[in-house]
């Protein structure tokens, strides 16, 4: 039985040209994490394999950095990076857990303007 839950950073926004950390956390299970895949829609961004370590897809190598932890850092953001991101935890013996993050990349002025009205 799959008892675990994935906690994610949820819906986040970031400024064009900036960077953002995509973070998921698997809790409430003792299952062993064998691999974590990070995907954007159907495109593979990165893999973190328990034995083989991190692998960034060649097309993202210049803009994606592994970590912190099992998370992923996206750099030099563009408006085209807006969309859904998925962390897919492959575990033993539970199976697969999936978390979803929605990233909105905003034009600099919009992001700054929006920040003024954020509730602390």
């Amino acid at each position: 039985m799959m008892t675990g839950t994935i906690e994610t950073t949820g819906n986040i926004s970031a400024e064009k040209g900036g960077s953002i950390i995509l973070q998921c956390h698997l809790s409430s299970t003792t299952a062993q994490v064998t691999q974590v895949n990070w995907e954007q829609q159907d495109q593979l961004l990165a893999i973190c394999n328990a034995d083989l370590g991190w692998h960034i897809s060649p097309s993202f190598k210049d803009r994606v950095a592994p970590g912190p932890g099992l998370g992923l850092t996206l750099q030099s953001l563009t408006v085209n990076d807006t969309g859904e991101y998925f962390c897919i935890y492959h575990t033993y013996p539970d199976g697969t857990y999936t978390g979803r993050i929605f990233l909105e990349v905003l034009e600099s002025s919009v992001a700054e303007h929006g920040a003024r009205f954020q509730i602390p």
Partner: antibody
Framework: QVQLVQSGAEVKKPGASVKVSCKAS????????MSWVRQAPGQGLEWMGI????????SFAQKFQGRVTMTRDTSTSTVYMELSSLRSEDTAVYYC???????????????WGQGTTVTVSS | DIQMTQSPSSLSASVGDRVTITCRAS??????LNWYQQKPGKAPKLLIY???SLQSGVPSRFSGSGSGTDFTLTISSLQPEDFATYYC?????????FGGGTKVEIK
């Protein structure tokens, strides 16, 4: 051209170890993962494990854990697979095979060695 | 481990026939599936990677399709040199398991 050349056939007694080599040429050795696959007589393909020639990290099928070692020598562009505590069921052809894309997750194996026959018999 | 099940285990066909081989994974593997051809006494040869991408130098009569758990290799018009054994393999998670193989024989 891209080539993987394996060492010659071996005959071993049960309980012994065998070390098979696979020498790569024609490409940047450190950039491509190398898998080992075996095939018992009349049987299908069985994936044994993989090595990253750059850092030396390995991953093995559970069946071979504790019995297999995969190493590499970057100076000679050679990978090695050593299997210990041999039994008759280990009689097979052993292949090394290169991942098809450099510096990436190993999606498929596009270049294969010629195979090394290992016979385990008392 | 992910189990890969191929069907049929063998089939008989004639030159010119359309041949379809299926492969099922025990869990979703997205499109991380490869197809290999092996002839007796020879090393396997990569035909298709990422479920549907044709490996360089492979004739266009070979095609792959599918995603998730169900995949298909199709030979549109079987040629004499295509009589061989075909294997699927998943490359999502280590260990990168193979299917049991499908032997294509002459009818």
């Amino acid at each position: 051209q891209v080539q993987l050349v394996q060492s010659g056939a071996e005959v071993k007694k049960p309980g012994a170890s065998v070390k098979v080599s696979c020498k790569a040429s024609g490409y940047t050795f450190r950039s491509y993962y190398m898998s080992w696959v075996r095939q018992a007589p009349g049987q299908g393909l069985e994936w044994m494990g993989i090595i990253d020639p750059s850092g030396g990290r390995t991953s093995f099928a559970q069946k071979f854990q504790g019995r297999v070692t995969m190493t590499r020598d970057t100076s000679t562009s050679t990978v090695y697979m050593e299997l210990s505590s041999l039994r008759s069921e280990d009689t097979a052809v052993y292949y090394c095979a290169r991942a098809r894309y450099p510096e990436s997750w190993p999606y498929g194996m596009d270049v294969w060695g010629q195979g090394t026959t290992v016979t385990v018999s008392s | 481990d992910i189990q890969m099940t191929q069907s049929p285990s063998s089939l008989s066909a004639s030159v010119g026939d359309r041949v379809t081989i299926t492969c099922r994974a025990s869990q979703s593997i997205n499109s991380y599936l490869n197809w290999y051809q092996q002839k007796p006494g020879k090393a396997p040869k990569l035909l298709i990677y990422a479920a549907s991408s044709l490996q360089s130098g492979v004739p266009s009569r070979f095609s792959g399709s599918g995603s998730g758990t169900d995949f298909t290799l199709t030979i549109s018009s079987l040629q004499p040199e295509d009589f061989a054994t075909y294997y699927c393999q998943q490359s999502l998670l280590t260990p990168f398991t193979f299917g049991g193989g499908t032997k294509v024989e002459i009818k």
